[in-house]
Amino acid sequence: MSSKYPRSVRRCLPLWALTLEAALILLFYFFTHYDASLEDQKGLVASYQVGQDLTVMAAIGLGFLTSSFRRHSWSSVAFNLFMLALGVQWAILLDGFLSQFPSGKVVITLFSIRLATMSALSVLISVDAVLGKVNLAQLVVMVLVEVTALGNLRMVISNIFNTDYHMNMMHIYVFAAYFGLSVAWCLPKPLPEGTEDKDQTATIPSLSAMLGALFLWMFWPSFNSALLRSPIERKNAVFNTYYAVAVSVVTAISGSSLAHPQGKISKTYVHSAVLAGGVAVGTSCHLIPSPWLAMVLGLVAGLISVGGAKYLPGCCNRVLGIPHSSIMGYNFSLLGLLGEIIYIVLLVLDTVGAGNGMIGFQVLLSIGELSLAIVIALMSGLLTGLLLNLKIWKAPHEAKYFDDQVFWKFPHLAVGF
């Protein structure tokens, strides 16, 4: 069995990716420079550590979380890294062009790298719904479109709804989920007879997926606090996220056992449900006034996640062609919505407490923000799905879905590797 790309893709991918990389290098050459001011070195190191946490989450966390397929684990990890590397470069430029360009140059700081890494994370969340059904050339397109869509969404939300960096980035959960689901909906769905085993999980890849989940679990507080403006806000965000993910782990494992007739624990449920609390508190992590509230949110999120993992895959598999183990998309879509609702509730309580009028207007703005995020995600996702269906990309045949051997050179070419 041949492990090579089809000849046309061998021509298309390197040319497409390297041309794009050359274009990015030229853009960086003409339009960017480093922040020249002398920084307090201790502050610089602390700032770098946050960016490092985000990179670990993206490269190791999401890379391994999506690697549970029996015969698609190599591709999941490496393609994630490829998309992250490309996405960060494009996101830095795009954010700079959208926010700084009046000065003629994009100033690159550790903060802009942090923002860019978070933007690229959006693609890594979305791609869970399509990994195994697309090749690298198609993923390049997905990265470019999604990062561009998210960057523009964030700018529009900033300008229209006047939200800060944290708030407009926290729409990432809902945006990435709906983007991924709409792309998946456009791709060819049915798995031909005889290939069903490829989208099943295997023990060793499942262990690496659990490792990915653990990395995400450890670093989620960094993600939720990365764009907050003050140490007080960051402290609250870190604490609340930590309590929420801690409770969602307990809920995920016990809830998974409860959902099984024999009381067994499902690896798939646990992979995603351990992160549920972090997603649910993301938007409001700096506003939650006490630990118990974050813990209750973690509990509810864990239950929603396990419930979703039990009942939604059938529907997602039929309608969107998403395999049972790729549950990040609908998980994040539900939990992201929960998080947004919690934020709106806290906003109302805060506004009432301050004795200000216009509560209805504030709520309307928040709902408008959320709706805009969903609409842009769906529209850009559908556009991406249509682009990925073009013959030019030489997409893998349905019979070659979820197969590392289509993309990788294995000396032994053994089926069970």
Partner: antibody, heavy 121, light 111 residues
């Protein structure tokens, strides 16, 4: 007691550079975002720049982007504003101000007394 | 860049009540703009009065209060004193970066 003391102002020719400093005392400087605000003679206040508590992010009003650089040294409890390519319209009293940000609060609570920068040939 | 508009001047009698407003060119002002109000007397640095729409500082006299009124930020002075004669500025924060934009200021005269 919170104190902010600006220095470094003076008379400078157009196109030249100047560096303002703001020495902070009476609070944990490294826990607060800091702003520069200016006021042209006989005019209103104009916000100029902000730097986050850890120096990780900086933002500027469009009219000074690419010319002014805000920075801080938390070990010295000092805020800086490096002003390059100065223009006549940059003539103003420059104030530094401390920002409290917490949850749904944003507050410029303490201000320095200001330092006068005059750009004239 | 957004423009923040205030009444150029207002006159009030001692003991009276006056409301200063602050409008944004981008539309209705909400708590998300974190309206701040400052008082500045001639030859002095600005002094913070109200932040985050309605929260007062420990040094802010009780007669000052902040709110939102009809899509604008508002500062109300009740029982105005002669020493309240000053220039009043509002500050709104905009966008992802939360850049500040000051209003043009309101000169309050106490006659």
């Amino acid at each position: 007691e919170v104190q902010l003391v600006e220095s470094g102002g003076g008379v400078v020719q157009p196109g030249r550079s100047l560096r303002l400093s703001c020495a902070a005392s009476g609070f944990t400087f490294s826990s607060y975002g800091m702003h520069w605000v200016r006021q042209a003679p006989g005019k209103g206040l104009e916000w100029v720049a902000v730097i986050w508590y850890d120096g990780s992010n900086k933002d500027y009003v469009d009219s000074v982007k690419g010319r002014f650089t805000i920075s801080r040294d938390n070990s010295k409890n000092t805020l800086y504003l490096q002003m390059n390519s100065l223009r006549a319209e940059d003539t103003a009293v420059y104030y530094c101000a401390r920002e409290l940000a917490k949850g749904r609060l944003r507050d410029l609570d303490h201000w320095g007394q200001g330092t006068l920068v005059t750009v004239s040939s | 860049q957004a423009v923040v508009t205030q009444e150029p001047s207002l006159t009030v009698s001692p003991g009276g009540t006056v409301t200063l407003t602050c409008a944004s060119s981008t539309g209705a002002v909400t708590t998300g703009y974190y309206p701040n109000w400052f008082q500045q007397k001639p030859g002095q640095a600005p002094r913070a009065l109200v932040h985050s729409t309605s929260k007062k500082h420990s040094w802010t006299p009780a007669r000052f209060s902040g709110s939102l009124l009809g899509g604008k930020a508002a500062l109300t002075l009740s029982g105005v004193q002669p020493e309240d004669e000053a220039e009043y500025y509002c500050l709104l924060f905009y966008g992802g970066a939360q850049l500040g934009v000051f209003g043009g200021g309101t000169k309050l005269t106490v006659l």
